[in-house]
Interface confidence: low
């Protein structure tokens, strides 16, 4: 899988979407997990409703929510009040039995809040191509990593 990068602003919400083939994954629950290092396991953060027919109901685990549009084939994860420690590599998964198929690999990047002037000399402001005019909007800027880009570099 290519890795898709979603960038959000610290303190705001970030919405991550994972499209999938609704027929291929019919009847399957979904999950959002965090990759533990280059070779480590993917630790479950939150999963959709135990009853697949109720997958549209938003489920929360702390500040992370998940909801599944099973007809349209889109899994949506919301990270509320994004913090620096939320940055990292995640996966959207489709569950079947004890197995999990990766729907999308996601790299979450957390940008400094441009309205936070506590340490202005150390802030990195998003470029003009990335629009953050409205502080209340859920920002979700995504890009795909190139084949050569590896989110977890080979162990040295």
């Amino acid at each position: 899988h290519n890795t898709t990068v979603f960038q959000g602003v610290a303190g705001q919400s970030l919405q991550v979407s994972c499209p999938y083939d609704s027929m291929k994954h019919w009847g399957r629950r979904k999950a959002w997990c965090r990759q533990l290092g280059e070779k480590g396991p993917c630790q479950r953060v939150v999963s959709t409703h135990n009853l697949w027919l109720l997958s549209f109901l938003r489920r929360w685990n702390g500040s992370t929510a998940i909801t599944d549009d099973t007809l349209g084939g889109t899994l949506t994860i919301t990270l509320r009040n994004l913090q620096p420690h939320d940055a990292g590599l995640y996966q959207c998964q489709s569950l079947h039995g004890s197995e999990a198929d990766t729907l999308r690999k996601v790299l979450v990047e957390v940008l400094a809040d441009p309205l936070d002037h506590r340490d202005a000399g150390d802030l990195w402001f998003p470029g003009e191509s990335e629009s953050f005019e409205d502080a209340h909007v859920e920002h979700s800027i995504s890009r795909s990593l190139l084949e050569g880009e590896i989110p977890f570099p080979p162990t040295s």
Epitope: R34, L36, G37, E38, G40, Q43, Q83, P84, H85, D86, A87, G88, L89, L107, V108, E109, V110, L111, A112, D119, D122, W124, I150, P151, F152, P153, S156
Partner: antibody, heavy 124, light 108 residues
Framework: QVQLVESGGGVVQPGRSLRLSCAAS????????MHWVRQAPGKGLEWVAV????????YYADSVKGRFTISRDNSKNTLYLQMNSLRAEDTAVYYC?????????????????WGQGTTVTVSS | DIQLTQSPSSVSASVGDRVTITCRAS??????LAWYQQKPGKAPKLLIY???SLQSGVPSRFSGSGSGTDFTLTISSLQPEDFATYYC??????????FGGGTKVEIK
């Protein structure tokens, strides 16, 4: 092999400045978040600062915020810590450390490579 | 800030003993905890990350467990080279990253 080598420590008077350097080799420096951690004589470990792999984000301990600045030069594979307005309580061995996670910065993985440390003594 | 409290602060043990060190977080940190070993005059060495993942090159006699607020580092059979100070560290909520106060493992 993977290595971090700190330099720049020494004896300095209170209120003066010092800049520490940390030269990295054996890994892709520009892909990893980097930390500074210090240890006062006979005491435990205290985290000082972290900088993202690309320098885009920097975070500090309250005890050094506004006085210390972490930076990096990826073209030189070097991490820096600029220490201003030094106080006696800043006396410690300073270690630079590489974050295990890579790519985006320090986030819940731990520090898998450490330098040998450089000693900073603040005394009049 | 998240505080980490290690216990005991020191432990006397013999070669071959099973040694257990605990680390308690002041709030839920899920599994985001690392363990380090430090010998006098040396830099810390990462043993365990993400509460239970053994760092490459670390002997299998070291193991980590726990989640939430209570964590444990276990040395199944203490070896002469294991006499050192051990620190836990959380990296889930920062700044600041925080370390526990340390546990010194001494020869009985």
């Amino acid at each position: 092999q993977v290595q971090l080598v700190e330099s720049g420590g020494g004896v300095v008077q209170p209120g003066r400045s010092l800049r520490l350097s940390c030269a990295a080799s054996g890994f892709t420096f520009s892909s990893y978040g980097m930390h500074w951690v210090r240890q006062a004589p006979g005491k435990g470990l205290e985290w000082v600062a972290v900088i993202w792999y690309d320098g885009s984000n920097k975070y500090y301990a309250d005890s050094v915020k506004g006085r210390f600045t972490i930076s990096r030069d990826n073209s030189k594979n070097t991490l820096y810590l600029q220490m201003n307005s030094l106080r006696a309580e800043d006396t410690a061995v300073y270690y630079c450390a590489k974050d295990l996670g890579g790519y985006y910065g320090g986030a819940a993985y731990g520090m898998d490579v450490w330098g040998q440390g450089t000693t900073v003594t603040v005394s009049s | 800030d998240i505080q980490l409290t290690q216990s005991p602060s020191s432990v006397s043990a013999s070669v071959g003993d099973r040694v257990t060190i605990t680390c308690r977080a002041s709030q839920d940190i899920s599994s985001w905890l690392a363990w380090y070993q430090q010998k006098p005059g040396k830099a810390p060495k990462l043993l365990i990350y993400a509460a239970s993942s053994l760092q490459s090159g670390v002997p299998s006699r070291f193991s980590g467990s726990g989640s939430g607020t209570d964590f444990t580092l276990t040395i199944s059979s203490l070896q002469p080279e294991d006499f050192a100070t051990y620190y836990c560290q959380q990296e889930v909520d920062y700044p600041p990253l925080t370390f526990g106060g340390g546990t010194k493992v001494e020869i009985k």
